[in-house]
């Protein structure tokens, strides 16, 4: 740690004498901050010597000695007073700029230590400080106003005590500004706007700061709008409010409107896009295939997006047919608007019965008129199965339907014993009936088909199963021939 | 010149609340605490509190705390002071008046007179 | 809360004689900043208050020189050297150290 000489840490002098401060290390030394012209500086081995011949008041303050190579960053200090009888400040600035809720510091150094017990703080020309300011004086540094409010930015004079008067400094202005924590607030009304041609349109850019000092501007595209800007004050900022109103709008009017404020911390910036048609319009849209394949018994949503201007005069859910009248109840269909011209209906389709399979149409109307979108729901079954025993050209053959939806296929199985259901271990033989007859196939109803087994003889010790399967499940139906015929039955559930 | 304008007297039924105003004008209105003064007929003056108006914080005289809210409109240069419950013993002349260090500027004052 | 003396309540007077009109605070009202609040008024009938001293012994700009105050700690003194006419009124001391500020009861400046 470098040493002063002399030790301080005050040295009090007068007015025209000399004062050498003398800095040594043990490596090179340096005198921090800018040292005035009064003062010659000197290097003399491993110390630094500053020195004057003809000190005066304005040499008053702290003079900090450092030594670069030090990895500790030790420092020593001198605080030197030069009293004049005539000065007893010395100011270091005019102007001092915190943010409020800071400590200020107003540098005026006391040039004589002795007048500490008779200093105060006043404001500029004797007036007194608001009684709100709280301050506290280091004779080294000057008085600091303890967590500055704006209303504290005035000018303000440091004042000392000399036989009895007050001797006021040089003023001192002291500006408080607000924490200004961001770029102003933007609100961009509409986020986006259609209009017919020829209609009239409004667009408001407004900004908020919290303080009156910042600038916003509307632009159309990459030019500059010149509108009336009004001002206001509410919830403890200050607003700006620029309002573009057009009478007739025209293609011209359209595209991109950018809100930009600025403040000292920044521009924030904020945008929206002006559409001009030339009539109304209705779009009807689905994220969804329109036919649409549901399991009976489970739910289902349909969701239609509608893009439209002006606004819907009306809008349904409506059930086509072909099963029955019923049509869609009102609490199952829902309504979200997206934005101004975006919305979504929904309807709920909750376990679907066999008679709610389908066609439902979705309808909306506006100026532009009538647009529908139409859903078709075809509901999935596990197969059902049957068998019968029958003889078909003097043959016995076996008929199997099966009745599900998607189509069913059909595979024949005989295995070993008398069972309800064939399992592995027992079958004996399998054959896969590739082109079961469909005997019946209308829309949004189950497919029934239809397949023959053969058998000039049935073996009396087995089991001839019909198995149906299809993308929802499957089912079975079993044969067992009897001596005096046959006896059918489906396998235990 | 630096004018204190109030608003006009006020006759009220006890239990409502009052609002009254004080307009500055002929200097910046951010700069200077608004201070609010009571006189009750034939009696000295009482302290009501102070605000800044540029944050809005405020100093009551606990005595009045609950009864009196004072604000600020900025963009008016408005300082107002709301009273509430009132009773007889709120009927008295009120003032708003600058503060610098020291009250300098006062109002004309406002009568509010509560009576049933 | 800081309570302000004033004595005279009331103080009858001829144009042209001295008068003097104390005011005694309960505790100092010396702020923690150094500065003494204490502050003279005067109050017309019908009308507000005027500022006359502030600081102790500061006069208000446009106040007649024949107003002086002084004191220090819990004391102080508005003197008026040669009363005029218009100077009748109620004269108030008040501080504006202490939360909550006061005034003091007033004093009566009144032609005997």
């Known amino acids: 740690i470098p040493v002063i000489e002399p030790s301080g840490p005050e040295l009090v002098v007068k007015p025209g004498e000399t004062v050498t401060l003398r800095c040594v290390g043990n490596g090179s030394v340096e005198w921090d901050g800018p040292i005035s012209p009064h003062w010659t500086l000197y290097s003399d081995g491993p110390s630094s010597v500053l020195t004057t011949n003809n000190a005066t008041f304005q040499n008053t303050r702290t003079y900090r000695c450092t030594e670069p190579g030090d990895p500790l960053g030790g420092s020593a200090a001198i605080h030197l007073y030069v009293k004049d009888p005539a000065r007893p400040w010395n100011v270091l600035a005019k102007e001092v700029v915190v943010f409020e809720d800071q400590d200020a510091l107003l540098p005026c150094l006391l040039t004589d230590p002795v007048l500490e017990a008779g200093v105060s703080l006043v404001r500029l020309r004797g007036r007194p400080l608001l009684r709100h300011t709280n301050y506290s004086f280091s004779p080294w540094h000057g008085f600091i106003i303890h967590r500055a409010k704006f209303i504290q930015g005035q000018d303000y004079q440091c004042s000392a005590l000399m036989g009895g008067r007050k001797v006021m400094s040089i003023s001192i202005r002291l500006k408080v500004q607000k924490v200004i924590p961001g770029p102003p607030a933007l609100t961009l009304v509409p986020a986006e706007l259609v209009r017919i041609r020829g209609e009239a349109a409004q667009i408001v850019c407004s900004a908020s700061n919290i303080d009156v000092d910042f600038d916003v501007f509307l632009q159309h595209n990459t030019t500059k709008l010149a509108i009336p800007q009004r001002s206001d004050f509410h919830d403890n900022r200050y607003q700006k409010v620029l309002t573009l109103s057009l009478g007739q709008v025209d293609f011209q009017h359209a595209g991109n409107y950018s809100c930009v404020a600025s403040n000292v911390q920044g521009k924030h910036s904020t945008s929206m896009f002006f559409q001009v048609v030339e009539s109304a319009y209705l779009d009807l849209s689905s994220e969804q295939n329109l036919i649409q394949e549901v399991t009976v018994g489970e739910g289902l949503n349909l969701k239609v997006m509608v893009e439209a201007y002006p606004g819907l005069q009306g809008f349904n859910w409506t059930y086509l047919g072909p099963f029955s009248d019923h049509q869609p109840e009102p609490k199952l269909a829902n309504a979200t608007t997206k934005d101004t011209y975006r919305h979504t209906f929904t309807l709920s389709l909750p376990r679907l019965k066999p008679s709610e399979a389908g066609r439902y149409s979705f309808l909306a109307r506006n100026p532009g008129g009538w647009r529908a979108l139409t859903f078709e729901l075809t509901l999935r079954y596990p197969p059902e199965v049957s068998v019968i025993w029958t003889s078909i050209n003097g043959s016995g053959t076996l008929l199997c339907a099966a009745s599900g939806y998607p189509q069913p296929n059909v595979t024949w199985l005989q295995c070993a014993g008398h069972t309800d259901r064939c399992d592995e271990a027992q079958v004996l033989q399998v054959w896969v009936d590739p082109h079961p007859e469909v005997l019946s196939q209308e829309p949004f109803q189950k497919v029934t088909v239809q397949s023959l087994l053969t058998a000039e003889t049935l073996e009396h010790n087995q089991t001839y199963e019909c198995r149906a399967h299809n993308s929802v499940g499957s089912g079975s139906w079993a044969f067992i021939p009897i001596s005096a015929g046959a006896r059918t039955h489906p396998p235990d559930e | 010149e630096v004018q204190l304008q109030q608003s006009g007297p006020e006759l009220v039924k006890p239990g409502t609340s009052v609002k009254i105003s004080c307009q500055a004008s002929?200097?910046?209105?951010?700069?200077?605490?608004m201070n609010w003064v009571k006189q009750s007929h034939g009696k000295s003056l009482e302290w009501i509190g102070d605000?800044?108006?540029?944050?809005?914080?405020?100093t009551y005289n606990q005595k009045f705390r609950g009864k009196a809210t004072l604000t600020v409109d900025k963009s008016s240069s408005t300082a107002y002071m709301e009273l509430r419950s009132l009773t007889s013993e709120d009927s008295a002349v009120y003032y708003c008046a600058r503060y610098d260090g020291y009250i300098d500027y006062w109002g004309q004052g406002t009568t509010l007179t509560v009576s049933s | 809360d800081v309570v302000m003396t004033q004595t005279p309540l009331s103080l009858p007077v001829s144009l042209g004689d001295q008068a003097s009109i104390s005011c005694r605070s309960s505790q100092s009202i010396v702020h923690s900043n150094r500065h003494t609040y204490l502050e003279w008024y005067l109050q017309k009938p019908g009308q507000s208050l005027k500022l006359l001293i502030y600081?102790?012994?500061n006069r208000f700009s446009g106040v007649p020189d024949r107003f002086s105050g002084s004191g220090s700690g819990t004391d102080f003194t508005l003197k008026i050297s040669r009363v005029e006419a218009e100077d009748m009124g109620i004269y108030y001391c008040f501080q504006g150290t202490h939360v909550p500020l006061t005034f003091g009861a007033g004093t009566k400046l009144e032609l005997k």
């Open positions: 002929g200097y910046t209105f951010t700069v200077y605490y």
């Open positions: 605000i800044d108006p540029n944050t809005g914080d405020s």
């Open positions: 600081g102790v012994s």
